[in-house]
């Protein structure tokens, strides 16, 4: 077809000088020479579709996909990736070819896929398809440990399918509540994969390698404890193993334990019992319910009953896919300069989330605490009273969640002033956002009380510190004002701050900085 444009598709690899995330054009990169991706017309496709060779990219590498179009006149374009439209700004090179680029910074799995470029020229419309994949490489992982029963023994094996092979340890505690915190003297750690002593109050297995530490608690119903106000709930994904331990203590051995799922006794082979005498000669019995690989029909109320204790239940919910439940509406807060304050997000999630708090492109560690109602909470207090936008981000592989917070710090304005040949400008942060007045200082008004009603332009702008607003006011200079002193004042409910400027001077002339509280 004569009308078809001459198209060249190229890949430009960049050597990153840094590995911070960002999509700005000023990203510090050194480029290698372009590699031709040989854009070929795709046969038997509806419309004109060019297909570039598949691009394989290392994780964290940065690349540019570029199309050079030899076609007369202007072109317009649109990138589409995973059903989202992305901005497209064509430009022309020295040979007057249209150039369209897509920069991918710090390649991740989420950026892999098909990139479609739609180009419209005066002569014709056509589509260019790029497929970007991650170069296959091995993965270091840290997976949450799970339990298996040891063959022919009443013991649990703790397994974490991780690389490098993790150090596995059991964390045991025989007291209640707070005293079972990690570094408490009541906590005993055993660096081994198999655990025979399964009668403890709190049993966890932890796996650690250079990626961190992951723990799994043995879900337990204790018939000697008062039941929680809300029914304990256990989430699992299809295919994961289920382990629930029922524990009861009685003055003698004359009692038994049974498990039921939705009022039906568990099948033979899905439970096992152990018993022992404690130091004070009371009998401890434990009964495990287990399913090596859960299916949807394993969902329901698991009830542990005893002939000598009130029965207790737990709700086991089997999900196909993990989730994060929380309200994602943005929240705005205003606080005083010395007021104590923490951001807080309450959520329910399975599997457990990884999270970060971000402010001004800096990430902070995120701690989460489990609540009694099955929810978790993450708090962030380390804002150091810096106003701006704070972002909570959580993910667990199946789901992602982001919540925005804005923090405003109530304070009196502080004015910065500057002057050019044609105008004077003042800016101020402060909160609430200040209003402005301009006054002229003259022989008639040595205290600068004469209002300047005209030529003033006010605006608010977002400063680099994300989410922090700055108000500015500009005075356009008339010939009549040159050589005069003027005063700009910013005021809000907490006070006023002023700056005095000599008009027609190259810089600020703040020989007086008034502060009227």
């Amino acid at each position: 077809n004569q009308d078809l444009p001459v198209i060249k598709c190229v890949l430009i690899n960049h050597k990153n000088n840094d590995s911070s995330v960002g999509k700005s054009s000023s990203y510090p990169m050194v480029s290698e020479s372009p590699e031709d991706l040989g854009c070929a017309l795709r046969p038997q496709s509806a419309g004109t579709v060019y297909e570039a060779a598949t691009v394989e990219v290392d994780v964290s590498a940065s690349i540019t996909l570029q199309v050079l179009v030899d076609t007369p006149g202007n072109i317009s374009c649109l990138w589409v990736f995973k059903h989202s439209s992305l901005n497209c700004q064509p430009h022309f090179d020295v040979q007057n070819r249209g150039v369209v680029s897509m920069v991918i910074l710090k390649m991740t799995e989420t950026q892999a896929g098909e990139y479609l470029l739609f180009i419209q020229s005066e002569a014709t419309n056509y589509t260019i398809l790029f497929t970007v994949s991650i170069r296959n490489t091995l993965l270091f992982t840290l997976r949450r440990p799970y339990f298996r029963k040891m063959e022919n023994q009443d013991a649990l094996v703790c397994i974490s399918e991780s690389v490098p092979e993790p150090i596995v340890e059991w964390v045991l505690c025989d007291s209640q509540g707070e005293s079972c915190k990690e570094e408490s003297p009541a906590v005993v750690k055993k660096e081994e994969k198999v655990l025979h002593e399964l009668f403890g109050t709190d049993i966890r297995c932890c796996a650690r390698n250079e990626l961190g530490r992951e723990c799994t608690r043995l879900f337990t119903i204790d018939l000697n404890q008062t039941p929680q106000t809300t029914l304990p709930q256990l989430f699992l994904k299809v295919g994961e193993p289920l382990w629930i331990r029922c524990k009861a203590v009685h003055v003698n051995h004359g009692f038994g334990l049974t498990w039921e799922l939705e009022n039906k006794a568990l099948e033979e082979g899905s439970y096992f019992e152990m018993s022992t005498y404690s130091t004070n000669r009371t009998m401890i019995r434990i009964l495990f319910a287990f399913v090596s690989s859960v299916a949807r029909n394993d969902t329901g109320y698991y009830t542990c009953s005893s002939s000598k204790h009130p029965s207790q239940s737990a709700l086991v919910t089997i999900v196909e896919k993990g989730f994060i439940n929380a309200t994602n509406s943005s929240e705005d807060y205003e606080i005083d300069q010395y007021e104590e304050f923490c951001f807080s997000v309450r959520f329910k999630a399975y599997p457990q989330i990884r999270c970060t708090w971000t402010f001004s492109r800096k990430s902070f560690p995120c701690e989460q605490k489990g609540l009694d109602d099955g929810y978790s909470v993450s708090k962030f207090c380390n804002h150091k009273h810096q106003p701006g936008e704070y972002i909570f981000h959580a993910e667990n592989g199946d789901a992602q969640f982001t919540k925005m917070f804005t923090l405003n710090i109530r304070r009196k304005p502080q004015v910065l002033a500057e002057a050019s040949a044609s105008q004077a400008s003042c800016s101020s942060d402060g909160y609430p956002l200040p209003s402005w007045t301009w006054k002229k200082c003259s022989d008639k008004s040595p205290n600068c009380t004469e209002d300047i009603p005209e030529g003033v332009w006010n605006r608010k702008a977002n400063r680099k510190v994300f989410g922090q607003w700055v108000s500015s006011s500009t005075l356009n200079m008339s010939e009549a004002m040159k050589g005069f002193l003027v005063k700009c004042c910013a005021y809000n409910s907490l006070g006023t701050s002023c700056e005095t400027i000599l008009l027609n001077s190259p810089g600020p002339f703040p020989f007086i900085q008034d502060s009227i509280s």
Partner: antibody, heavy 129, light 107 residues
Framework: QVQLVESGGGVVQPGRSLRLSCAAS????????MHWVRQAPGKGLEWVAV????????FYAESVKGRFTISRDNSKNTLYLQMNSLRAEDTAVYYC??????????????????????WGQGTTVTVSS | DIQMTQSPSSLSASVGDRVTITCRAS??????LNWYQQKPGKAPKLLIY???SLQSGVPSRFSGSGSGTEFTLTISSLQPEDFATYYC?????????FGGGTKVEIK
């Protein structure tokens, strides 16, 4: 550019202590696992220790366990190796090296395996009476 | 601990020769193996990661192969700048362990 610079080496008597530092620049230090590796004069490389990206997990070679402590200060982009009860056999050039970058991959915390890809120039520790 | 046995411990070769160095692990380490090059007075340099992946910026004459317990580093055509000591490192389990090294000298 990406750089690691070790410091703190020197001559020390057996039984004494020394602290090595490794200053990182040009990359997001707090996202990477970090290692110490040493090399005795005329000998091969010996891995010493690794610390996780957030600093809560450490692993050591048997030869240094209980005597050496690896730590990091992410706010200062610095890795440390505290060496106590030093012995003559600890005499070596000590290198710090960058490990993997933490990420979430298919729901699992992990990193793509690229080995120890960036090394410092080394700092010399001599243990002698 | 996993032992890494490297062979030969040294070899003499000429420019243009094909050179093969092997590394044997005492138990399976999947493909979690790196190859490093070290020149006197310098820090080691990563050549191959994950047993067979070439590190960015490393000449294509270097290649790695193997998985499980047997691994090989091959230099297809030895260049003057390749005379150095080469080490393998297993990163499958703690403690991490290096091979004893192979010194490649000029014949």
């Amino acid at each position: 550019q990406v750089q690691l610079v070790e410091s703190g080496g020197g001559v020390v008597q057996p039984g004494r202590s020394l602290r090595l530092s490794c200053a990182a620049s040009g990359f997001t230090f707090s996202s990477y696992g970090m290692h110490w590796v040493r090399q005795a004069p005329g000998k091969g490389l010996e891995w010493v220790a690794v610390i996780s990206y957030e600093g809560s997990n450490e692993f050591y070679a048997e030869s240094v366990k209980g005597r050496f402590t690896i730590s990091r200060d992410n706010s200062k982009n610095t890795l440390y190796l505290q060496m106590n009860s030093l012995r003559a056999e600890d005499t070596a050039v000590y290198y710090c090296a960058r490990g993997g970058e933490i990420t979430m991959v298919r729901g699992v915390i992990g990193y793509y395996y690229y080995g120890m890809d960036v090394w410092g120039q080394g700092t010399t520790v001599t243990v002698s009476s | 601990d996993i032992q890494m046995t490297q062979s030969p411990s040294s070899l003499s070769a000429s420019v243009g020769d094909r050179v093969t160095i092997t590394c044997r692990a005492s138990q399976s380490i999947s493909s979690y193996l790196n190859w490093y090059q070290q020149k006197p007075g310098k820090a080691p340099k990563l050549l191959i990661y994950a047993a067979s992946s070439l590190q960015s910026g490393v000449p294509s004459r270097f290649s790695g192969s193997g998985s499980g317990t047997e691994f090989t580093l091959t230099i297809s055509s030895l260049q003057p700048e390749d005379f150095a000591t080469y080490y393998c490192l297993q990163h499958n389990s703690y403690p991490l362990t290096f091979g004893g090294g192979t010194k490649v000298e000029i014949k």
